[in-house]
Interface confidence: low
């Protein structure tokens, strides 16, 4: 006899034996127990062998059981969730053999001083790992290699002084990383790789700002909208990004993202990115925007531009992602806003002296008769980046622009593949005529077409940049015009700022602007690095259009794409998809490579 209560939870029998002064597993538990709560007892030690006959056991809670040792000598083939939090465990046994189906492992609030290298071997299904509030001083290399499906990793409140450089390698699904309240001094070069991490917590460490911190600094600049300050009891989705929470312990707690890095060598390979204080005057290799659709906070992620080798100026590449799968939570799109410092939240101070981008290449592919790889004939709602100028706290359908933060959102259930690849060639200057006008006309059978024009002038090589005006029509929920003015930063040595005005008129919701006419060409924007240099003309190979427009010398070009009824569709750009990427001549490592 025992005092455990039982409950029904779908097909699982839930047995609650919490706080019953148990010193061992009750002898008469139902054989079909699916959820077992043993928390707040005095078990001391626990062996999985005691549960092997519970073939339905899916959730096991052993929190606050005064555990000093755990033995994994019995296989629990269905166990998905194991809670070992708030115990006195100083070490963990290898778990993979005994718990092959484990998806959530909570060993927080224990006394783990270290982890053996193979402790997670075999946990191929693990999605959440909670190790916060232990005494971890280091992590073994390759710790997370077996856990390729990991989504949440909490290492907060430990004593970590450093991180293995490849800790996150292969964790393509990782979306939340807690590293706050450790003793970290720096982040290893390349630590984050190309991962999209919507939620990262890095505050309350001993960040030491010197030349070794430059990689981390650049990453923070790129991911300013993804760095948060953790608060007890507050859901991360309800908080505001706070990249300034990551501070230099040695520089009077100045934010790491604004560390000048003056005097640091730029050619020693300190970072995975170029140092923008001294970038060579060569074309950019790519501009990328990633966004996540798995949370309600849709954040623009800027991948800083890398300089192409001088030997490759005749051929460069813009990399686009493989065909979008609805089940994935990452997509990548070309986007027409240069990732200047003005895209950081309002709380940050722009410092163009430290962080000015000298070269930006932007592509908006035009509609084409090429069918997407899914052979979908009609323009169903597809994966469309919808750029709205609003802060994170702005309601979703707000039409009030806030020019300090750029949010990228997308419909969550889209099914149309996104563009795959585009080839850029850079001919020698002054060898190709440059059209300077593009007429953008919307298609709407039931209404008068709305002409949208952008008249752009190609200046002579000089230090004066030319203002541009674009009128874009956006179908929003309101008919109230929403004027938006963006003053764009000019290159450092320019003496004339370039104002750009975008006037948005918002017709009735029924006026659905679905696409651009097929004659509209891709728009390529190239920003010069210095006023003295001759404009670098970058031409898009004409796979599917007959025109192109070169927009030279603009530091930033902003394309407003509305939420809801988007009128800029992104069709396939080239006939290269993810399953042919390895053999594609376009994907030579000399150019660029697909993003994950």
């Amino acid at each position: 006899q025992h005092t455990c209560s039982i409950s029904k939870v779908t097909s699982l029998l839930e047995v609650n034996c919490e706080n019953k002064k148990l010193t061992a597993l009750p002898a008469d538990l139902p054989a079909d127990t699916g959820i077992l709560h043993l928390g707040e007892n005095q078990l001391g030690t626990f062996s999985t062998a005691s549960l092997v006959h519970f073939t339905h056991l899916t959730y096991l809670y052993l929190d606050r059981c005064e555990l000093t040792s755990l033995q994994t000598n019995g296989k629990l083939i269905k166990l998905e969730n194991l809670d070992l939090s708030h115990n006195n465990l100083k070490s963990l046994p290898s778990l993979g053999w005994a718990l092959p189906a484990l998806t959530t492992l909570d060993v927080s609030f224990n006394k783990l001083g270290s982890l053996s290298p193979g402790v997670l071997d075999g946990l191929s299904q693990l999605q959440e790992l909670y190790l916060q509030n232990n005494d971890l001083k280091s992590l073994p290399p390759g710790l997370l290699l077996p856990t390729t499906k990991l989504k949440k990793l909490n290492l907060a409140n430990n004593k970590l002084r450093e991180l293995p450089s490849g800790l996150l390698d292969g964790l393509e699904d990782l979306d939340t990383l807690y590293l706050q309240r450790n003793w970290l001094r720096t982040i290893p070069k390349g630590f984050f790789g190309t991962l999209l991490l919507p939620f990262v917590f890095l505050h309350a460490n001993s960040w030491y700002c010197d030349c070794e911190i430059l990689y981390f600094r650049h990453w923070l600049q790129e991911n300013a909208n993804n760095v948060y300050l953790w608060k007890q009891g507050v859901d991360v989705k309800d908080t505001t990004p706070n990249v300034a929470s990551v501070r230099c312990a040695n520089l009077d707690n100045a934010p790491v993202y604004s560390y000048p890095g003056k005097g640091c060598p730029t050619s020693s390979g300190d970072t995975d990115y170029d140092d923008y204080d001294d970038i060579p005057d060569v074309p950019a290799t790519r501009t990328e925007v990633k966004f996540s659709t798995n949370t309600k906070v849709h954040t623009t992620h800027w991948s800083l531009l890398a300089a192409a080798p001088s030997t490759s100026q005749d051929s460069q590449m813009i990399s686009l992602p493989p065909t979008h799968k609805p089940t994935k939570k990452q997509s990548t799109f070309i986007h027409t806003q240069s990732p200047g410092f003005t895209t950081l939240p309002e709380t940050m101070e722009s410092n163009p002296t430290f962080y000015s981008l000298k070269l930006n290449t932007v592509l908006i592919p035009s509609p084409t008769t090429l069918e997407p790889t899914s052979t979908q004939a009609t323009p169903e709602p597809n994966i469309q980046p919808m750029l709205t100028t609003s802060t994170l706290t702005t309601p979703e359908h707000s039409t009030t622009p806030v020019p300090t933060t750029t949010i990228l959102t997308t419909p969550e259930h889209s099914t149309i593949p996104v563009p795959t690849t585009a080839i850029l060639t850079t001919p020698k200057p002054s060898t190709i005529p440059v059209p300077t006008t593009a007429t953008l006309t919307t298609l709407e059978p039931s209404t008068t077409p709305v002409p949208t024009t952008a008249t752009l002038t190609t200046p002579e090589p000089s230090t004066t940049l030319v203002p541009t005006t674009a009128t874009l029509t956006t179908p929003e929920h309101s008919t109230t015009p929403v004027p938006t003015t963006a003053t764009l930063t000019t290159p450092e040595h320019s003496t004339t700022p370039v104002p750009t005005t975008a006037t948005l008129t918002t017709p009735e919701p029924s006026t659905t602007l679905t696409n651009l006419v097929s004659t509209i060409s891709p728009v390529l924007t190239t920003t010069l690095t210095t006023p003295e240099s001759t404009p670098i003309e970058t031409i898009l190979e004409q796979f599917f259009t007959t025109e192109l427009t070169l927009l030279p010398t603009l530091e930033s070009t902003t394309t407003i794409i509305p939420e809801q009824n988007s009128f800029l569709n992104l069709p396939e750009v080239a006939l290269v998809s993810s399953d042919t990427s390895e053999s594609s001549p376009f994907l030579n490592s000399d150019f660029c490579c697909f993003l994950p």
Epitope: Q1, S5, I6, S7, K8, V9, T10, L13, D28, L29, P30, A31, D32
Partner: antibody
Framework: EVQLVESGGGLVKPGGSLRLSCAAS????????MSWVRQAPGKGLEWVSS???????YYPDSVLGRFTISRDNAKNSLYLQMNSLRAEDTAVYYC????????????WGQGTTVTVSR | DIVMTQSPDSLAVSLGERATINCKSS????????????LAWYQQKPGQPPKLLIY???TRESGVPDRFSGSGSGTDFTLTISSLQAEDVAVYYC?????????FGGGTKLEIK
């Protein structure tokens, strides 16, 4: 037809013991959880105990440690051993078949009366 | 323990009229994983054992007339007899089968007006 027939009730002094039995027929007894539910005179229904098809017993706090439920699948029988009886245990005791786990009761016996009195 | 409270204690309704009995639980009986409410209704006629009428709030047991229906969610539930018949005179009990110990309401005595 499902039938449940209780027996073993009677008059007993406080502190005394009784053993109730329930004979089941008309269904595969070993496949079902079984329960005892009681009803004090003029009062409502109170769950007393359940036992899973695998033989795991459950009790409310009011009888825990005093009552023991058991089953004999070979005899298609359910039992309730009642010790340390109190006046408040006086009631009609129903044997009931539980649907699924020990949850709701789809067939009931006619009941047997237990009276605890000096 | 989950406490079940029925109202009214007794109810008199004319033949052919609608009878409504309420049952309230001290905590939600809704299982969010399968969206089922774990509530059953029983009918007990004088001198007889209870008879199962409805389980999972609204699922009628086989053989129960369709004039009996159950509704509700979370903590508030209702048993409705759409057209009272003479044989419906009885005491009606609700019972939660969500979490042990299984508990019953105090009962509602239904009479003919």
């Amino acid at each position: 037809e499902v039938q449940l027939v209780e027996s073993g009730g009677g008059l007993v002094k406080p502190g005394g013991s009784l053993r109730l039995s329930c004979a089941a027929s008309g269904f595969t007894f070993s496949s079902f959880a079984m329960s005892w539910v009681r009803q004090a005179p003029g009062k409502g229904l109170e769950w007393v105990s359940s036992i899973t098809s695998a033989g795991t017993p459950y009790y409310p706090d009011s009888v825990l440690g005093r009552f023991t439920i058991s089953r004999d699948n070979a005899k298609n029988s359910l039992y309730l051993q009642m010790n340390s009886l109190r006046a408040e245990d006086t009631a009609v005791y129903y044997c009931a078949r539980s649907r699924g786990y020990e949850d709701y009761f789809d067939y009931w016996g006619q009941g047997t009366t237990v009276t605890v009195s000096r | 323990d989950i406490v079940m409270t029925q109202s009214p204690d007794s109810l008199a309704v004319s033949l052919g009229e609608r009878a409504t009995i309420n049952c309230k639980s001290s905590q939600s009986l809704l299982n969010s994983r399968n969206q089922k409410n774990y509530l059953a209704w029983y009918q007990q006629k004088p001198g007889q054992p209870p008879k199962l009428l409805i389980y999972f709030t609204s699922t009628r047991e086989s053989g129960v007339p369709d004039r009996f229906s159950g509704s509700g969610s979370g903590t508030d539930f209702t048993l409705t007899i759409s057209s009272l018949q003479a044989e419906d005179v009885a005491v009606y009990y609700c019972q939660q089968h969500y979490s042990s110990p299984w508990t019953f309401g105090g009962g509602t005595k239904l009479e003919i007006k």
